[in-house]
Every structure is written in structure tokens, then in C-alpha cells.
């Protein structure tokens, strides 16, 4: 849906949810590109750009959550995810530099696409939770323990090690996203109902 | 390989009911949304309904009174049940399925349609 | 429900050539869906989620666009490439498509 602008229903609402997820668990749309960008695309380095455990709420975590409470520590996460896409931005080549050092410019785009999809998404999140909110059963909400809070990096001690810190930062996101995908096609076709 | 197989369509005269069938192979109803789309002659498509996997449905409002969607798992056979039928809804009916078991509205395999002609 | 404006309504081009189709909508969509209809034949889906090929799919065709406008680009005209093209959303209920782009051979 636009920003701003809530559909009603339940069904086109989910699948707009599933949709965004399926999209930002594509490693195609922001890892990679990243990868490529900081020049960290040989084999050797690839191996340090696993995620650090417990940056994320786990797949577990998010399945024992109530639906609500679900959007509420996907919302969080998100902000969270948010601030530090713009970190990493103010961190990127510039432009000109990349096309000078013959690196692809798509790919900056690429990285520069994913905080308005974000905003996309939560757009979409506040949607569904207002629609729930609406809905005649009332499921309690069990609280989320919030965003496990995402990334605060460690002190970087120089460039490098903050190039490996956003590489493991997005290897992460993509595998919470998957996640957050996963919960979302078990979700039921109404939202008086869940298949859990 | 996935298909989807029309059948049904004839010419009926106006006010009369006729029902589509929609023959689904290499992939099972239970697990993907089937769609109905439309195509009136020289004109563009339509959407008309859904039949979610779990059987749920959504129509579009402009046919949710004359026109029911439904299926048949153990058939993987879909159907379109449409009453009171008027010259305009003359045209090719298309299924065809979503690309995967989300919620997604959109189309990545389409059978080849049935004509309905509605004539007096 | 959104409405999906296409333009041109035909477009003449020979083989060889590069074809740019519009799609604009009435409110803002998240995703366009492109798909190519032959006569006598059932539509086909090119183009997902605004600019991913569909499985199948020649490089050639390319879809780019946000908000309202969507484009779809074929760069290099195949004599098979000749047929209407239809856009379609989904982020508003119902889903609808455009009136369709006919691309003939000048």
C-alpha cells in the first residue's frame, strides 16, 4: 500500500506483508551489493560476514509471540534496522568515487533502496496491526522482549573491522527477515484466526 | 509441468447460469490461490475472484452477487458457478494460479480460457 | 479501486528498436506486474514485483518505476516481442490492469 494509505483488506494487506518480507530476505537487494561496494567479495573475507548470535530475535522468539505482539517486535526491530541503514550509508562511496574505481553504480542504488522499503514495510505493519486492533477476537498479547536490540556495533578499530560489522549487521537482517517471512505465510485467512 | 485446463463455456441466452470448470495439473489447489480473470472481445482483462489454499475467497465487487467461486481439492478442480448472466458478460475466463502459497494477487500461469457468449 | 492509465495506446516500432510502455496509476502502488498477451493466446507474466524477470523471461524486456509511474522497456524489438502489454497492481483492493499498450510493426 502507499505510504500513508491503510488497505482494509485483511488478505491484500498479508500478502503486501509476505510480499516486502520474500523481497528483504533476498541477499540480492542489499548483502551482496554491500559485499561488492566495500570489497569484501573474496572467499576469505566472505567467512567473517556471519552474523554475531543473538542480534536478532530469533525465529523461536518470533513464533511465540501473539500476532500483535509480533508486529510490535517487528516495528521495533525495524527502527532499529533503520537507524543503523543510515550509518552504513553515511559510511559509502560516493558516487563518483565508484564509478571511478569501476564498481557498479546498481549497487549503490540497490543499498540506497532499502530504507525506503523499510518504511514501506512499516507502513504496511501499522496497517495490519490497526486491522487486527479492529477485529472482533481480541488475542492477548504476549509481549515481545522488544527488538533484541539490533547492532550496536562493537568499536570498530578501523575501517575494516566497521566493513565486517555492517557485512555480519546485514547477513543478520536478511536471516531475521527470512524469519519474520516464514512466520507471516503461517499466518491464517482471516484475522480472527491464526495458524500457528 | 503446471496447467490449467478450461471448460464450460458456451453460448446462453441472458438471465440464464452457467458453470466453469478449471482443471489443475502438476501442482495441488490445497496448496496455491486460483484466480479468474476476464476478457471481453477486443477489450482488456478483469479480475473477477479468488479461491485461497484454505478455501477462503475473494471476489471482486462488481460480480459478488451473481458469481461464486469454489473448488474441489480432491478434484483439483476449480469452479465458477455464474447466475443471471447478461450480454456483457460476454467473454474469455481465464484461472490462473498465484505463484506461490502467500497471499500473492497476481498470475504466473494461466490456462488457455473458455469463450461464454451470452445471447438471446 | 486504483486505476492503471497506459500509454501509448499502440506503439509502432520496427525490429531492432527499443519499445518504453508507461503504466500510471490513480494512487500510489508498491509493485507493478507487466504481462504480454498474443492474439489467441492467454496472457503471459514478464515482469514481477515492478522490475524482476519472470522465469522464462529474455533479458531484453526490463521493468523500472515507483509511487505512480511504471515503465516497462524492451531494448532490443524481436519480431515475437509484437503484442499488447498489460500492468497490474495489487497494493489496493481489487486488483486491476491497465487498458493495455498494443505494440505493432511499423
Known amino acids: 500500500a502507499a505510504i500513508g494509505s491503510c488497505s482494509k483488506e485483511y488478505r491484500v494487506l498479508l500478502g503486501q506483508l509476505q510480499k516486502q518480507t520474500d523481497l528483504m530476505q533476498d541477499t540480492s537487494r542489499l548483502l551482496d551489493p554491500y559485499i561488492r561496494i566495500q570489497g569484501l567479495d573474496v572467499p576469505k573475507l566472505r567467512e567473517h560476514c556471519r552474523e554475531r548470535p543473538g542480534a536478532f530475535p530469533s525465529e523461536e522468539t518470533l513464533r511465540g509471540l501473539g500476532r500483535r505482539g509480533f508486529l510490535q517486535t517487528l516495528n521495533a526491530t525495524l527502527g532499529c534496522v533503520l537507524h543503523r541503514l543510515a550509518d552504513l550509508e553515511q559510511r559509502l562511496p560516493k558516487a563518483q568515487d565508484l564509478e571511478r574505481s569501476g564498481l557498479n553504480i546498481e549497487d549503490l542504488e540497490k543499498l540506497q533502496m532499502a530504507r525506503p522499503n523499510i518504511l514501506g514495510l512499516r507502513n504496511n505493519i501499522y496497517c495490519m496491526a490497526q486491522l487486527l486492533d479492529n477485529s472482533d477476537t481480541a488475542e492477548p498479547t504476549k509481549a515481545g522482549r522488544g527488538a533484541s536490540q539490533p547492532p550496536t556495533p562493537t568499536p570498530a578499530s578501523d575501517a575494516f573491522q566497521r566493513k565486517l560489522e555492517g557485512c555480519r549487521f546485514l547477513h543478520g537482517y536478511h536471516r531475521f527477515m527470512h524469519s519474520v517471512g516464514r512466520v507471516f505465510s503461517k499466518w491464517g485467512e482471516s484475522p480472527n484466526r491464526s495458524r500457528r | 509441468q503446471v496447467q490449467l485446463v478450461e471448460s464450460g463455456g458456451g453460448v446462453v441466452q441472458p438471465g440464464r447460469s452457467l458453470r466453469l470448470s478449471c482443471a489443475a495439473s502438476?501442482?495441488?489447489?490445497?496448496?496455491?490461490?486460483v484466480h479468474w480473470v476476464r476478457q471481453a472481445p477486443g477489450k482488456g482483462l478483469e479480475w473477477v475472484a479468488v479461491?485461497?489454499?484454505?478455501?477462503?475467497?475473494d471476489y471482486n465487487a462488481a460480480f459478488m452477487s451473481r458469481f461464486t467461486i469454489s473448488k474441489d481439492n480432491s478434484k483439483n478442480t476449480l469452479y465458477l458457478q455464474m447466475n443471471s448472466l447478461r450480454a456483457e458478460d460476454t467473454a474469455v475466463y481465464y484461472c490462473a494460479k498465484s505463484p506461490n502459497s502467500n497471499f500473492y494477487w497476481y498470475f504466473d500461469v494461466w490456462g488457455r480460457g473458455t469463450l461464454v457468449t451470452v445471447s438471446s | 479501486e486504483i486505476v492503471l492509465t497506459q500509454s501509448p495506446a499502440t506503439l509502432s516500432l520496427s525490429p531492432g528498436e527499443r519499445a518504453t510502455l508507461s503504466c500510471s496509476g490513480s494512487s500510489s502502488v508498491s509493485y507493478m506486474y507487466w504481462y504480454q498477451q498474443k492474439p489467441g493466446q492467454a496472457p503471459r507474466l514478464l515482469i514481477e514485483?515492478?522490475?524482476n524477470l519472470a522465469s522464462g523471461i529474455p533479458a531484453r524486456f526490463s521493468g523500472s518505476g515507483s509511487g505512480t509511474d511504471y515503465t516497462l522497456t524492451i531494448s532490443n524489438l524481436e519480431p515475437e516481442d509484437f503484442a499488447v502489454y498489460y500492468c497490474q497492481q495489487w497494493s489496493s483492493y481489487p486488483p486491476t490492469f491497465g487498458q493495455g499498450t498494443k505494440l505493432e510493426i511499423k
Open positions: 479461491i485461497w489454499r484454505g478455501g477462503s475467497t
Open positions: 514485483d515492478t522490475s
Open positions: 502438476g501442482f495441488s489447489l490445497t496448496n496455491y490461490g
